[in-house]
């Protein structure tokens, strides 16, 4: 079974978030993908790709760059010059129309804090390099213990189709999702 886990990423202001979302090639290679932020009950689409061509081109919307690799089943997301107000829950989705999106695993919980140095985002340290396992003192770029239950609101009267290998789980009128913390 596919685990739905919220992955926590902790950054300083000025750094760059870099993630990837994978999808089932045979289903979604030709679909548009989007990067969205959960804001209250409604997800807000921040950027979306064009329909893929033979040579995919990055799509840039402000500080966000999306690059789809339809031949590989991967979407690359980069968010540069992170700010405290960027903190929140993000998801990659297969973009159909606002009321129906296929959520790609895993939701990303982004936490951005003020940098301790006077020059956040300097070229030497613009991307967080700590991605060790949670057992170390460094913040891990991956699932960390948040809380066993995190409430995530979905759009009212909408259907979220969660893609899992070989099946689809239709969650209608989702009011909360149990997130299982992963330990190393």
């Amino acid at each position: 079974t596919t685990e739905l886990t919220e992955e926590k990423y902790e950054y300083k202001e000025g750094q760059t978030l870099e993630v990837k979302c994978d999808y089932a090639l045979e289903k979604y290679a030709n679909s548009r993908k989007a990067w969205q932020k959960m804001e209250g009950k409604m997800p807000k689409i921040l950027a979306k790709t064009e329909r893929p061509s033979e040579n995919s081109h990055p799509v840039q919307v402000g500080r966000i760059t999306l690059e789809d690799y339809p031949d590989h089943g991967l979407l690359q997301v980069r968010m540069t010059n992170l700010q405290v107000e960027d903190s929140g829950l993000y998801q990659c989705v297969i973009y159909q129309h606002p009321k129906e999106s296929h959520v790609l695993f895993n939701p990303i919980c982004l936490v951005v804090t003020k940098g301790s140095s006077g020059t956040p985002g300097s070229s030497e340290n613009s991307t967080q390099n700590v991605y060790r396992t949670p057992s170390t003192t460094a913040k891990a770029l991956g699932p960390r213990y948040t809380s066993p239950r995190t409430v995530t609101q979905a759009p009212p009267e909408s259907t979220v189709v969660v893609s899992t290998p070989g099946s689809e789980i239709n969650l209608t009128n989702v009011t909360d999702i149990i997130r299982v913390p992963v330990f190393n």
Epitope: E18, Q76, N184
Partner: antibody, heavy 123, light 107 residues
């Protein structure tokens, strides 16, 4: 500690298929992508593709796309790479590799390697 | 695809020497570059990630630098156990590609 243990050496005839297994231990199998890298004798390293053990999704480079299948069995923390329609130039050591960062991180740094499986294709 | 060109393809140095290997990308890859060490008959080992970060357990005589298209891997004082082939690898985009390798021998 993290360990990736691969299946033993194989000798195959041209046109046949080979399935290499990679058993993971020492970490949460579904949290990290497994990649496959091969190395022909005396040659360099060649990335074949990746698989997310959680979603089961995978992708491979064009060169192998029609011939390679990457699967997993999460209950036994094992990844598999099957290569079909073998030819002599597929003779190589095949490595399964775990990335340094979690599956959602764009961190393609190959941190933990299996011991390698030598596949010999000969008539 | 991004091509990674390593130079030299082989080099011979004495114990205690400072050794430098370079890797050039066919286009800007920012800092998305790793270095590996491979000893005969063994699997490669990650040495440097993100161009300049030393992997845990790797001796401090190893270092990496560079960004954009030009990268350098340095061994400040060559030891007998450093005899191996070294590979660079980019991950700026897909597909991931490796350099052709640099074989390091003791004089």
């Amino acid at each position: 500690q993290v360990q990736l243990v691969q299946s033993g050496a194989e000798v195959k005839k041209p046109g046949a298929s080979v399935k290499v297994s990679c058993k993971a231990s020492g970490y949460t199998f579904t949290s990290y992508d497994i990649n496959w890298v091969r190395q022909a004798t005396g040659q360099g390293l060649e990335w074949m593709g990746w698989m997310n053990p959680n979603s089961g999704n995978s992708g491979s480079v064009k060169k192998f796309r029609d011939r390679v299948t990457m699967t997993r069995n999460t209950s036994i923390s094992t990844a598999y790479m099957e290569l079909s329609s073998l030819r002599s130039e597929d003779t190589a050591v095949y490595y399964c590799v775990r990335l340094i960062g979690y599956s959602s991180a764009w961190k393609w740094s190959f941190q933990h390697w299996g011991q390698g499986t030598l596949v010999t294709v000969s008539s | 695809d991004i091509q990674m060109t390593q130079s030299p393809s082989s080099l011979s140095a004495s114990v205690g020497d400072r050794v430098t290997i370079t890797c050039q990308a066919s286009r800007d890859i920012s800092k998305y570059l790793n270095w590996y060490q491979q000893k005969p008959g063994k699997a490669p080992k990650l040495q440097i990630y993100d161009a300049s970060n030393l992997e845990t357990g790797v001796p401090s005589r190893f270092s990496g630098s560079g960004s954009g298209t030009d990268f350098t891997f340095t061994i400040s004082s060559l030891q007998p156990e450093d005899i191996a082939t070294y590979y660079c690898q980019h991950y700026d985009n897909i597909p991931i590609t490796f350099g052709q390798g640099t074989r390091l021998e003791i004089k």
